[in-house]
Amino acid sequence: SEGRKTWRRRGQQPPPPPRTEAAPAAGQPVESFPLDFTAVEGNMDSFMAQVKSLAQSLYPCSAQQLNEDLRLHLLLNTSVTCNDGSPAGYYLKESRGSRRWLLFLEGGWYCFNRENCDSRYDTMRRLMSSRDWPRTRTGTGILSSQPEENPYWWNANMVFIPYCSSDVWSGASSKSEKNEYAFMGALIIQEVVRELLGRGLSGAKVLLLAGSAAGGTGVLLNVDRVAEQLEKLGYPAIQVRGLADSGWFLDNKQYRHTDCVDTITCAPTEAIRRGIRYWNGVVPERCRRQFQEGEEWNCFFGYKVYPTLRCPVFVVQWLFDEAQLTVDNVHLTGQPVQEGLRLYIQNLGRELRHTLKDVPASFAPACLSHEIIIRSHWTDVQVKGTSLPRALHCWDRSLHDSHKASKTPLKGCPVHLVDSCPWPHCNPSCPTVRDQFTGQEMNVAQFLMHMGFDMQTVAQPQGLEPSELLGMLSNGS
């Protein structure tokens, strides 16, 4: 995903930030109103300009500055750690007028044995340690406080939780003589929530637990536990919801089977099976009860865990997710795609679509991509004419004052948005594809031909001539 080069070279990082004590809770914040864009769809740009100008004119009247940065807070409870024993933490940007809180779980694969964790530690240490984290991060996409970039929840309290546990946010084991690494992903989330209660979360109306990739799977694994935690701590009125982006994987048959040697070629079922033991992973209780002991790995797969969840969850998933293709040993590297592989890819999209059939709140464009919600251009993709921020807004409305999605969809405000066209990038609003080798942008027609799709076969079901279809796709229609 874009805009995420935040590492600092050794010797260039600032001194570690001081561990700040929790600020006393401010007076009861006033709820800000969700924006309803129903009437302004046609003239969104000028509406946004007005909103921004209004927002900026109000800034001098408040304690907030127009500062996009989220600030690092290392956990006060230093026994809740990253893999290497350094304290876990979170980045926070408060929005005192809002009772909405967005907690975002970062992604970044995982490691599942000593060897690949050692190698990860020596090449991707920021995903295993907080030692070199920068003091601040810029909020992008759904974490942005700019209404043009984030028309959905720009005014929310933004929390970014860095992924440093390598366990798909599921682990509950600490570093010891026996364990070289701690795997505390599930505990990190609990501790962050606990600390945020002292920073204003206690007055929240809605807590949206969001995440991308491994963080998206982390949402599915932790959303009910967070709701339960808040209930037990005496905050039953906070509505907990989930937004899982690019974390809804299939335990399908790999295109080419390979032995489980490293993280990216190991079949997902086998990687998770091994990982769960190595991490002492925990899964949602209601899901765990559905499977025998030793079969908890099933709960890492969205279509199996989702039906057991109590909290409402919105699922965002590219139908042709690059991480899914990677674990399935599909590597699109510029060579024309053979028919067997083309059929495999098409079938993957079909299977994914089928698993989302009974997910009322979902957004699944037929694109080849990975992650979306913290991309700056997350507003660009549409399914059936509806953008993701708009779909999320409709979802909010459908959940208004209730903990479960209402059965009747709001008129003109859809929340179940799954592309039905059958091939990658048949949706013209998909992110631009670049030729892997020339780096040149490809239009949809070029991409499909490059993928080995026969235009005759593609055009026929649409009732079009291949030349007509090519013309339409080239024009992005």
Epitope: S1, R8, D118, D122, T123, T333
Partner: antibody, heavy 119, light 111 residues
Framework: DVQLLESGGGLVQPGGSRKLSCAAS????????MHWVRQAPEKGLEWVAY????????YYADTVKGRLTLSRDNSKNTLFLEMTSLRSEDTAMYYC????????????WGQGTSLTVSS | DIVLTQSPASLAVSLGQRATISCRAS??????????IHWYQQKPGQPPKLLIY???DLESGVPARFSGSGSGAAFTLNIHPVEEEDAATYYC?????????FGSGTKLEIK
Amino acid sequence: DVQLLESGGGLVQPGGSRKLSCAASGFTFSDFGMHWVRQAPEKGLEWVAYSSSGGTTVYYADTVKGRLTLSRDNSKNTLFLEMTSLRSEDTAMYYCARASYDGGYFDCWGQGTSLTVSS
Amino acid sequence: DIVLTQSPASLAVSLGQRATISCRASKSVSTSGYSYIHWYQQKPGQPPKLLIYLASDLESGVPARFSGSGSGAAFTLNIHPVEEEDAATYYCHHSRELPFTFGSGTKLEIK
């Protein structure tokens, strides 16, 4: 100043053994994964082996597997490469390199030690 | 194993002109927003020297005429404007997974 200094090269008979060393200074050795990279005369770079920062994981290129043993002594800031059953194709300049932990790139290289396998 | 194919094997560029070297991986070396491709320069009798890391970040002390780009499986090293001292062999290297591998090298000659 960050420095890596290889030693132990020289002339060895085919089938013979040799132990190369790499002495590190100017940085916390135990913080970094270390690698050996070799270069045959007039040829390109070939990655040979990796030792994790704690020394608990080692990984070898297929071309050398079974004939090389990589180890490190973090208390002495030294990396070792023990080579057995040497062949003429092992003739090369052997470099020890430090891998940056925010990407795995080699941000520091030694000057190399030359090994010749010949009868 | 990931195979890196570097091209061209050699090139001659006039002083002040642009040199472009390509590196293709047999599968994607990008993940979680980072591309694990790095570029080195090697002159005869010397060890390699890091120029570009993580596809596009310039190593400190390296002149700004060196730049890197690309993602997924396709990467490029550009040198512009080329200077006399840039005559050397250039290698790409991936650290996405073990085993690490290098490209076969590109020898740059200044005309």
